[in-house]
């Protein structure tokens, strides 16, 4: 295993429908043919997998079916969106990039996005 | 909660085999890297051995490479530690351990199980 | 290969007292460190990781500094319950070697 700079922004704002985009960008310093993205969020001391996909460089990023996270890929770049977010959801979100293929496997650990989420207020009821 | 049990230790004599077994629960073990640490008696840990989630990438330490052979079956949640060709100096109690979410350090350890090779 | 070296290899200290143990790696590993303590007869357990991080459940007497290739960990007040040895480990590049360790006892 070998260390890799990984850079992702320091934060966002959600969108008032609870989505979040960010690109996650890693120096690599192989030819690396599989990439395995995982997502993380650390809350105090907690950090816990929101999502994870592995691709193959050139193809787009597969997450599982009923995966909160959508992306895709561009070289050393991957664009990272996540959906469903409520204002509980704030917090820090961690880029974690590994080099799966060939060996040797190279890690890299982004230092975190904060991901900011705003509750839309309930729109007024209306008497027309 | 999670749970790492080992077994498959024991007394064998320098130059045989021994296959150490580790069964994980309560964690979704294919998203983890798994590893192997031991702990010679009296003396410091010594990492051993890693295996990332589907178990084509490794990694060893340059005192076990060639003899030493880590393996996981996601299936039965199992990883696994084929030992040949067996040293006085390889007598140690051996840890299977978790890594962790962000990065190789290591979560979550099992009770150890000892190795005793012994003429 | 990069080598960890702790400092001291053991120490004596009263209980409430502050304790630093000193972490130092031959190249600079950026902040892939981790400490564990491991009770007398018992299983290692992680204390912090990313240096500086405290792992969940970890009480809050334990704290963690450095980058690059100096790391510290602090006892603020030290309990009859500290009484372990302490390693550190590198974890930036295989091999994740640990230090030689530190023997902590009460005086």
């Known amino acids: 295993c070998k260390a890799m700079h990984v850079a992702q922004p320091a934060v966002v704002l959600a969108s008032s429908r609870g989505i979040a985009s960010f690109v996650c960008e890693y120096a690599s310093p192989g030819k690396a043919t599989e990439v395995r993205v995982t997502v993380l969020r650390q809350a105090d001391s907690q950090v816990t997998e929101v999502c994870a996909a592995t691709y193959m460089m050139g193809n787009e990023l597969t997450f599982l079916d009923d995966s909160i996270c959508t992306g895709t890929s561009s070289g050393n770049q991957v664009n990272l969106t996540i959906q469903g977010l409520r204002a509980m959801d704030t917090g820090l979100y961690i880029c974690k990039v590994e080099l799966m293929y060939p060996p040797p496997y190279y890690l890299g650990i982004g230092n975190g996005t904060q991901i900011y989420v705003i509750d839309p207020e309930p729109c007024p009821d209306s008497d027309f | 909660q999670v749970q790492l049990v080992e077994s498959g230790g024991g007394v064998v004599q320098p130059g045989r085999s021994l296959r150490l077994s580790c069964a994980a629960s309560g964690f979704t073990f294919s998203s983890y890297g798994m590893h192997w640490v031991r702990q010679a008696p009296g003396k410091g840990l010594e990492w051993v051995a890693v295996?990332?989630?589907?178990?084509?990438?490794?990694d060893y330490a340059d005192s076990v490479k060639g003899r030493i052979t880590i393996s996981r079956d996601n299936s039965k949640n199992t990883l696994y530690l084929q030992m040949n060709s067996l040293r006085a100096e390889d007598t140690a109690v051996y840890y299977c351990a978790r890594g962790g979410l962000l990065g190789p350090y290591f979560d979550y350890w099992g009770q150890g199980t000892l190795v005793t090779v012994s003429s | 290969d990069i080598q960890m070296t702790q400092s001291p290899s053991s120490l004596s200290a009263s209980v409430g007292d502050r304790v630093t143990i000193t972490c130092r790696a031959s190249?600079?590993?950026?902040?892939?460190l981790a400490w564990y303590q491991q009770k007398p007869g018992k299983v290692p357990k992680l204390l912090i990781y990313?240096?500086?991080t405290l792992q969940s459940g970890v009480p809050s007497r334990f704290s963690g500094s450095g980058s690059g290739t100096d790391f510290t960990l602090t006892i603020s007040s030290l309990q009859p319950e500290d009484v372990a040895t302490y390693y550190c480990?590198?974890?930036?590049?295989?091999?994740?070697?640990f230090g030689q360790g530190t023997k902590l006892e009460i005086k």
């Open positions: 990313a240096a500086s």
């Open positions: 480990q590198k974890y930036n590049s295989a091999p994740y070697t």
């Open positions: 295996i990332w989630y589907d178990g084509r990438n490794k």
């Open positions: 190249q600079g590993i950026s902040n892939y």
